[in-house]
């Protein structure tokens, strides 16, 4: 059956049991996700805005899929294996009375049974599983996986040791302070800096030590994962964001409608197809797209390119290049090059690299 | 590539009997529910019936409940429905559609057949 | 039960407009909600799932938005291949239908 091909999931709840306090529910579902990550690489986050990978719904009767539920007893819950859309979805029948302890339907236990499912667990022949298909009230403070249950996650996800440090081929979150950590885009918004990472970006507000990472879904539900390239205008309060042969305009951090827009109408060629990196520099008013070994001038106030371009990245950013992941302007005076794990600040006015550092040098590593 | 090639529509008396075959093939059959949509002419779509991976649970639109019948051949990558007491309201195009997940319905369908016409009359 | 309710029913417009079809839910469905075109004589296509998931193969120029009972299907600029039916549907329920037609 299906599983997730990331170790790295988000869960939300979308709505409350009355049964309950609402702090009562998160907890109860915050130690249900803790029972599996505790035998398993998987981590579990909890998000309140955005599309989430696993959806935890009370609801009563028809519900919105093809399975209603059937009122007091019977069908407690249930949920969807992984995948996308429904996948992962667990429902919870809200003509039962959730409780936190043995009286009517213990959350806690009913959520670690349905979080099995919605991890790719079938129901279990052994009894003592928490994946045997029948409710059963065991006491929730000494309670503990079956061996059966164990076995069936490990083999679908492994043990906790394993994959900690992996490359991130699943749009699972990148570790922060991994060496080797790179970005597919950085800008400043105003006084904050914008790290885009596959389906997530970090946010560090100038000057101060913390960061907070967030999915791109949960800021611009209509933004697609993997930006590219990005880039602000201040002085307007836009953000420009590139994917493939499309951008996105943002402003006053709010998507504008219209958009996407094909990166054609700056005026590239017809053989450009995706952007690698942009920054806009508020002296010349101008942005500069970097694509390959190239890259393009673009005058900001007349909306169109400058003559002359593409130039070789190497020719005229002397030790940058011959290709970049992202750039950001800062301080007035520097363009910060991200290429892979390093990072270069390279001073425009002088024309030279004044420091190289780490790409996660920003983040107190 | 998936295909879904739906057969045995055709014209029928009121109070007649009909079973329409659907045949799947390039996805593994075994694994997903499976469903029955209907559109009568010039009308809109209308959910018939599903089943699902194993052919163990089925359900069925109200207007059908009791006189049509959803059934599976994994071994065959077949999929039928029985259909009896047909009315003339039962008049459509049928497709077969196939749902995106196995153990509970979607209620996605991602890949439809081209329909088998099923006609009711006097 | 739940019910759809898809508005407009008929729609005119012409190669290059933006234009927007709604679905309302009678109660919230979270963002379980797919949009379908359906071109004369043929099946129905998946365009949309997940509300404002786009299915592989589909053209950018479409979006959808939405969750709980409000949702809406947006064509940016229409080509002249977009002119059809547009279903949403839920589970079971399939909204009654749009008709986009030329101007």
């Known amino acids: 059956g299906p599983v997730w091909r990331k170790h790295y999931i988000t869960y939300r709840i979308n709505n409350y049991t009355p049964d309950m306090n609402r702090e009562d529910v998160d907890y109860a579902i915050r130690k249900a996700f803790q029972v599996w990550s505790n035998v398993t690489p998987l981590k579990f986050s909890k998000i309140n805005t955005g599309m989430a990978d696993i959806l935890v719904v009370f609801a009563r009767g028809a519900h919105g899929d093809f399975h209603a539920f059937d009122g007091k007893g019977g069908i407690l819950a249930h949920a969807f294996g992984p995948g996308s859309g429904i996948g992962g979805d667990a429902h919870f029948d809200e003509d039962e009375f959730w409780t936190t302890h043995s009286g009517g339907t213990n959350l806690f236990l009913t959520a670690v049974h349905e979080i099995g499912h919605s991890l790719g667990l079938g129901h279990s022949s052994d009894p003592k599983a928490v994946m045997f298909p029948t409710y059963k009230y065991v006491d929730i403070n000494t309670f503990r996986l079956s061996a059966d249950d164990i076995r069936g996650i490990q083999s679908l996800y492994g043990d906790p040791k394993e994959n900690q440090r992996l490359p991130n081929p699943d749009n699972s979150e990148p570790a922060l302070c991994d060496p080797n950590l790179s970005f597919d885009a950085v800008t400043t918004v105003g006084n904050k800096i914008f790290f885009f990472k596959d389906r997530f970006f970090w946010l560090k507000v100038s000057e101060r030590p913390k960061t907070s990472v967030n999915l791109i879904s949960s800021l611009w539900p209509t933004l697609p994962s993997g930006i590219e390239a990005a880039y602000e205008i201040e002085a307007r309060n836009q953000v420009f964001l590139f994917k493939d042969d499309k951008y996105w305009l943002i402003s006053n951090l709010r998507p504008e409608p219209n958009y996407p827009k094909s990166i054609h109408s700056f005026g590239f060629p017809n053989f450009v197809k995706k952007i690698d990196a942009a920054v806009f520099n508020p002296r010349f008013y101008r942005t500069y797209f970097f694509v390959d070994n190239q890259y393009w001038r673009y005058d900001e106030r007349r909306q169109m390119m400058d003559p002359g371009y593409p130039k070789l990245i190497t020719k005229n950013f002397q030790g940058i290049g011959p290709k970049i992941d992202a750039v950001f302007y800062s301080k007035n005076k520097y363009y910060y090059f991200f290429q892979g794990s390093n990072q270069f600040e390279y001073d425009f006015l002088l024309q030279r690299i004044t420091k190289t550092l780490k790409s996660n040098s920003w983040f107190g590593c | 590539e998936v295909q879904l090639l739906e057969s045995g529509g055709g014209l029928v008396q009121p109070g007649g009997s009909l079973r329409l075959s659907c045949a799947a093939s390039g996805f593994t059959f075994s694994w997903y529910w499976m469903h029955w949509v209907r559109q009568a002419p010039g009308k809109g779509l209308e959910w018939v019936s599903g089943?699902?991976?194993?052919?163990?649970?089925?359900i069925y639109a109200d207007s059908v409940k009791g006189r049509f019948t959803i059934s599976r051949d994994n071994s065959k990558n077949t999929l039928y429905l029985q259909m009896n007491s047909l009315r003339a309201e039962d008049t459509a195009v049928y497709y077969c559609?196939?749902?995106?997940?196995?153990?509970?319905?979607?209620?996605?369908?991602?890949?439809w057949g081209r329909g088998t016409l099923v006609t009711v009359s006097s | 039960d739940i019910q759809m309710t898809q508005s407009p029913s008929s729609l005119s417009a012409s190669v290059g407009d933006r234009v927007t079809i709604t679905c309302r839910a009678n109660q919230s469905i979270y963002t379980y909600l797919n949009w379908y075109q359906q071109k004369p004589g043929k099946a129905p296509e998946l365009l949309i799932y997940?509300?404002?998931s786009l299915q592989s193969g589909v053209p950018s120029r479409f979006s959808g938005s939405g969750s709980g009972t409000d949702f809406t299907l947006t064509i940016s600029s229409l080509q002249p291949e977009d002119f059809a039916t547009y279903y949403c549907?839920?589970?079971?329920?399939f909204g009654q239908g749009t008709k986009l037609e030329i101007k």
């Open positions: 559609a196939k749902d995106i997940r196995g153990a509970y319905s979607s209620g996605l369908f991602d890949f």
């Open positions: 997940a509300a404002s």
């Open positions: 549907q839920q589970a079971g329920i």
């Open positions: 089943i699902v991976s194993s052919g163990g649970t089925t």
